[in-house]
């Protein structure tokens, strides 16, 4: 004969366990129903009555089947350097991730504890490894024959254009300048081919105050010449 289906609450077999979506209540010594995600245990079970569940209040949630007396509080609102990629609902916590151009410098269980602005490689340096959600850009000096004339977190070192006749040789921070407007081979996009003022020093497009402060943060600490702005989320 098929085993009789037990309805909660029920006493488990000696040495037995409760079924899926049930828990063993130590006080009642019975297997009782868990509450579904989005709810919590309003009244715990007894020997004769099952768990009474109730919906989570606003800004609280439960993500799993549970028997918690109170729902968990959703995390605080995302800070200015973050975007909300998952809203706070009765069944899930808010998740904040770093906004475009930023990366997570210090993660927490869900989302990010500390966002920082992606490094911008200065003229003469190009991106060797692009930034990701969780890692900063890695810059490298432009090798001979290549250049970068931008301050950018995405631009790589590009080859110098090849000239019939070179007016000004290229270097790490400047493309070659040709005497004619038709180099022998197509240039890298954005490469300069018309004569222009030449500087021997890298030009910086960012303000460069004294460097010894921590990178600019969302708490409005001073911004150094290039270290990243950073922000912090509430936990």
């Amino acid at each position: 004969l098929p085993a009789q289906v037990a309805f909660t609450p029920y006493a488990p077999e000696p040495g037995g366990t409760c079924r899926l979506r049930e828990y063993y209540d130590q006080t009642a010594q019975m297997c009782c129903s868990k509450c579904p995600p989005g709810q919590h245990a309003k009244v715990f079970c007894t020997k004769t009555s099952d768990t009474v569940c109730d919906s989570c209040e606003d800004s609280t949630y439960t993500q799993l089947w549970n028997w918690v007396p109170e729902c968990l509080s959703c995390g605080s609102r995302c800070s200015s350097d973050q975007v909300e990629t998952q809203a706070c609902t009765r069944e899930q916590n808010r998740i904040c991730t770093c906004r475009p151009g930023w990366y997570c410098a210090l993660s927490k269980q869900e989302g990010c504890r500390l966002c920082a602005q992606l490094r911008k490689c200065r003229p003469g340096f190009g991106v060797a490894r692009p930034g990701t959600e969780t890692s900063d850009v890695v810059c490298k000096p432009c090798a001979p024959g290549t250049f970068s004339n931008t301050t950018s977190s995405t631009d790589i070192c590009r080859p110098h254009q090849i000239c019939h006749v070179v007016a000004i040789p290229g270097n790490a921070s400047m493309d070659a300048v040709c005497t004619s407007t038709s180099p022998t081979r197509s240039m890298a996009p954005g490469a300069v081919h018309l004569p222009q003022p030449v500087s021997t020093r890298s030009q910086h497009t960012q303000p460069t105050p004294a460097p010894s402060t921590a990178p600019g943060t969302s708490f409005l600490l001073p911004v150094g010449p290039s270290p990243p702005a950073e922000g912090s989320t509430g936990d």
């Epitope: 500390l114 490094r119 810059c139 460069t208 150094g224 010449p225």
Partner: antibody, heavy 121, light 107 residues
């Protein structure tokens, strides 16, 4: 206030190992690149090793490559230098330094007080 | 490796003197050059970065110039607290070498 405090220096025999630590405070550790610089007694400064903020990218001077390993624990705000196969010429004060923010802000802006490593039999 | 040639290795000067220290590199380092000051028994301190920019809290009597392979640190009017050793450094390709230092002594 930015602080870098080195520890772990001492006397070690040639061929031995030592692990230096640098406890950092006063700044967002996980967003900064860090380096070790050393100075032999009465001599000039020598850059030893570098690690970027996420610990992905490391560089070493030729004199220590293959023997020293730089690492960091961003959860503990600590920088390390594991030194193996030590030689007499590794005797120096070792400084933990903040920077360079390589490719962007190229300088060492804060230095620890240094820890002395003496390699001698 | 990029060679750094710093000169002079030492100099004697008096308070109020104008002092110039030069640093020459074996190839262009595109102004990726800081200068440091070190006093006996102390850690070095950043003075200038990007060859010409003054670090926070550094007196304006310190200045830097140069580009390409030739760089200069100038102290316009030497003060008693400026007697120290000065180092240049490059941040182009690794290894990031320092100059051998210039010791500024009291005449």
């Amino acid at each position: 206030e930015v602080q870098l405090v080195e520890s772990g220096g001492g006397l070690v025999q040639p061929g031995g190992s030592l692990r230096l630590s640098c406890a950092a405070s006063g700044f967002a550790f996980s967003t900064y690149d860090l380096s070790w610089v050393r100075q032999a007694p009465g001599k000039g400064l020598e850059w030893v090793a570098y690690i970027n903020n996420g610990g992905i990218s490391t560089y070493y001077s030729d004199t220590v490559k293959g023997r020293f390993t730089i690492s960091r624990d961003n959860a503990k705000n600590t920088l390390y230098l594991q030194m193996n196969s030590l030689r007499a010429e590794d005797t120096a004060v070792y400084y933990c330094v903040r920077g360079p923010f390589y490719g962007s802000a190229n300088y060492f802006d804060y230095w620890g007080q240094g820890t002395l490593v003496t390699v001698s039999s | 490796d990029i060679q750094m040639t710093q000169s002079p290795s030492s100099l004697s000067a008096s308070v109020g003197d104008r002092v110039t220290i030069t640093c020459r590199t074996s190839e262009s380092i595109y102004s990726n050059l800081p200068w440091y000051q070190q006093k006996p028994g102390k850690a070095p301190k950043l003075l200038l970065y990007d060859a010409t920019k003054l670090a926070e809290g550094v007196p304006s009597r310190f200045s830097g110039s140069g580009s390409g392979t030739d760089y200069t640190l100038t102290i316009s009017s030497l003060q008693p607290e400026d007697f120290a050793t000065y180092y240049c450094q490059h941040f182009w390709v690794t290894p990031w070498t320092f100059g051998q230092g210039t010791k500024v002594e009291i005449k």
